[in-house]
């Protein structure tokens, strides 16, 4: 019986027309939501004038429905047993699942000021930036609506910059009507143990953001894994949101709507400094902010963001070194709320429930030439927001899954 089940599973998890896997892969049957919590800065003037600790108060959730669009340009390649596709982006605001509206205002770091002062480090150019920041009445902090902050706004300072720069700024700009990819993944026809594993991303097998093994595109996109998952496995996956591959390890057995699943979590070791985890040496890209690669829990992805000083972390700087969170007041990290997990049905390798949590931060540094940054006495990695992207298999799908997969095995 086991062999028959194995044979059926192997057949059904192949990514080709007609399989259960393919139908759910092209367009997820699960409702996926992305919740945002914005870090509202309570003391902007004190920070700017006295280099005080930044006092933040999180406000949220503000919820959007995401990943509701079917994959596009799905193309099978029979020669190398791969399927390529684009993953379109779309977000629909869900007022009933939110604490307010997209028009709610927040005091946040001025993204353009922080980014421009980092990108243009030439002292003379910084004096020009200073003039334009002042002329546009911009400052170190700004008040923006949720919609502006996430999806983009025309920045008054950048509009004056006499260089060819994008004048629209937003943490996720551009998002709607864009797509992630092209991804090319193995369809599993010739070797089921490779199904859903990424062969290339944007036509390449590596990212060009990191040195050595850190630059590799490993594993799947985390929506599914090759079947017959073992608890001892380290599950590798690539996340374009954080511009890197990462991994999850088994934590516990979980019962999800009557389906036995394995809960895999991102371990603290994945965020450790090279001192603690030598494998992470190539994620340390500079020596100053990282305090000679001894800081941990934040990832400098500026190379992936056109030089903008974006740092990714877990929410509330969970698993980060004390020096990172020391200049920020109002953070309360806890594993239950702020870690990332994947609940994987081990026979099929399908991720039936997940919570992807991450925080977007921006580095801001003192600048002698820019008046609004002149009084800063230290560097700040400023939290802007954190997000929780979740999906859970629906009741109907769970019933079908139990009857067709786990029920037959048990």
């Amino acid at each position: 019986g086991d062999l028959l089940i194995q044979k059926t599973i192997k057949k059904q998890v192949v990514l080709e027309e007609g399989t259960i896997a393919f139908k759910n892969w092209v367009k997820t049957g699960t409702e996926v939501y992305r919740q945002f919590w914005i870090f509202d800065v309570q003391n902007p003037q004190e920070v700017m004038m006295n280099s005080s600790n930044i006092q933040v108060k999180q406000r949220g959730p503000y919820t959007y429905r995401v990943r509701f669009l079917a994959k596009e340009n799905v193309t099978q390649d029979a020669e190398d047993n791969t399927v390529s596709f684009l993953q379109p982006n779309g977000a629909i605001f869900e007022p009933s699942l939110s604490v307010g509206t997209e028009a709610d205002n927040f005091t946040v770091l001025n993204l353009a000021v922080a980014a421009a002062s980092h990108i243009y480090q030439n002292q003379f150019v910084q004096m020009i930036l200073n003039s334009l920041i002042n002329k546009s009445k911009s400052s170190m902090f700004q008040v923006r609506t949720l919609r502006e902050l996430l999806w983009g706004y025309r920045d008054p300072f950048l509009s004056l910059v006499p260089y060819p720069v994008t004048t629209t700024v937003g943490l996720f700009y551009p998002y709607n009507n864009t797509a992630d990819g092209v991804y090319k993944v193995f369809n599993g026809k010739d070797n089921i143990s490779k199904v859903a594993i990424i062969d290339t991303y944007k036509g390449k097998r590596n990212l060009s953001y990191w040195e050595s093994h850190c630059d590799m595109i490993n594993g799947t996109d985390a929506a599914s894994f090759p079947p017959f998952v073992e608890k001892s496995q380290v599950l590798q996956f690539f996340s374009s949101d954080i511009c890197r591959s990462i991994y999850a390890v088994f934590e516990s057995d979980v019962n999800l709507k009557g389906i036995p699943v394995y809960r895999f979590v991102l371990p603290s070791k994945a965020f450790a400094s090279p001192v603690e985890n030598p494998d992470n040496y190539c994620f340390c890209t500079e020596k100053i902010i990282s305090k000679n690669c001894t800081s941990y829990g934040v990832l400098d992805i500026s190379k992936c963001k056109e030089g903008r000083p974006v740092y990714i972390s877990l929410p509330h700087f969970l698993y980060a070194s004390p020096d990172v969170s020391e200049p920020i007041d109002g953070l309360n990290p806890n594993e239950e709320e702020h870690r990332t997990y994947l609940d994987i049905e081990p026979i099929t390798g399908f991720t039936l429930q997940f919570a992807k949590r991450l925080q977007v931060n921006l580095l801001v540094k003192p600048s002698e030439k820019i008046q609004v940054l002149k009084n800063l006495k230290r560097n700040y990695i400023v939290p802007i927001l954190w997000l929780n992207e979740t999906g859970t298999i629906g009741d109907e799908k769970a019933n079908m899954f139990r009857s067709q997969v786990t029920g037959k095995i048990n």
């Epitope: 002292q123 003379f124 150019v125 004096m127 020009i128 200073n130 003039s131 002042n134 006499p162 008046q371």
Partner: antibody, heavy 116, light 107 residues
């Protein structure tokens, strides 16, 4: 528009000091760094230094340290450059120029003549 | 200090000509170079920033090019009002320095 008023000429004796002025109008004086440049007759331009009018923080060309002192008076939107222990080598035209899109607005310059 | 060499102190030209003024830096300055025009008895006027960008209001017959150590200001279709002295300036590092100037005169 940006306007920078500088006295046309100053005549000073060797060994004395002089304080050159540059009165700014047409923009927020404290918002833009002010630069000073020297030009000797028939010669090129030499950068003297810069000052942030918001807090009077100044940076100097090493060559002019001890010779030039930059100050501002925010209330009158005026930048000053004091030159001390004057010699004939200090005879030149001195320009002030605030940084906007670069050094894109220069005063008309003050001709300083050091002569006994 | 970075030295900027404008090898030609004088250049002769005629109205309608195309002329190129050169400037060589003693070390790499990227594209952190500006060009100025100065007429007798007047203060310098900014023409070009970042080696190749024209300031607003500067006629498009003025073109800047170059990066690293070699820079050129080209004036195509020279007009009589272009007869002046031209200075390059680097702002890659302090102190800011200027070239000695190139005087454009009629043949």
């Amino acid at each position: 528009q940006v306007q920078l008023q500088q006295p046309g000429a100053e005549l000073v004796k060797p060994g004395a000091s002089v304080k050159l002025s540059c009165k700014a109008s047409g923009y927020t004086f404290t918002s833009y760094w002010m630069h000073w440049v020297k030009q000797r007759p028939g010669q090129g331009l030499e950068w003297i230094g810069e000052i942030d009018p918001s807090d009077s923080h100044a940076n100097y060309n090493q060559k002019f340290k001890g010779k030039a002192t930059l100050t501002v008076d925010k209330s009158s939107s005026t930048a000053y450059m004091q030159l001390s222990s004057l010699t004939s080598e200090d005879s030149a035209v001195y320009y002030c120029a605030p940084i906007h899109y670069g050094l894109d607005n220069w005063g008309q310059g003050t001709t300083l003549t050091v002569s006994s | 200090d970075i030295v900027l060499t404008q090898s030609q102190k004088f250049m002769s030209t005629s109205v309608g000509d195309r002329v190129s003024v050169t400037c060589k830096a003693s070390q790499n300055v990227g594209t952190n170079v500006a060009w100025y025009q100065q007429k007798p008895g007047q203060s310098p006027k900014a023409l070009i920033y970042s080696a190749s960008y024209r300031y607003s209001g500067v006629p498009d017959r003025f073109t800047g090019s170059g990066s690293g150590t070699d820079f050129t200001l080209t004036i195509s279709n020279v007009q009589s009002e272009d007869l002046a002295e031209y200075f390059c300036q680097q702002y890659n590092s302090y102190p800011l320095t200027f070239g000695a100037g190139t005087k454009l005169e009629l043949k």
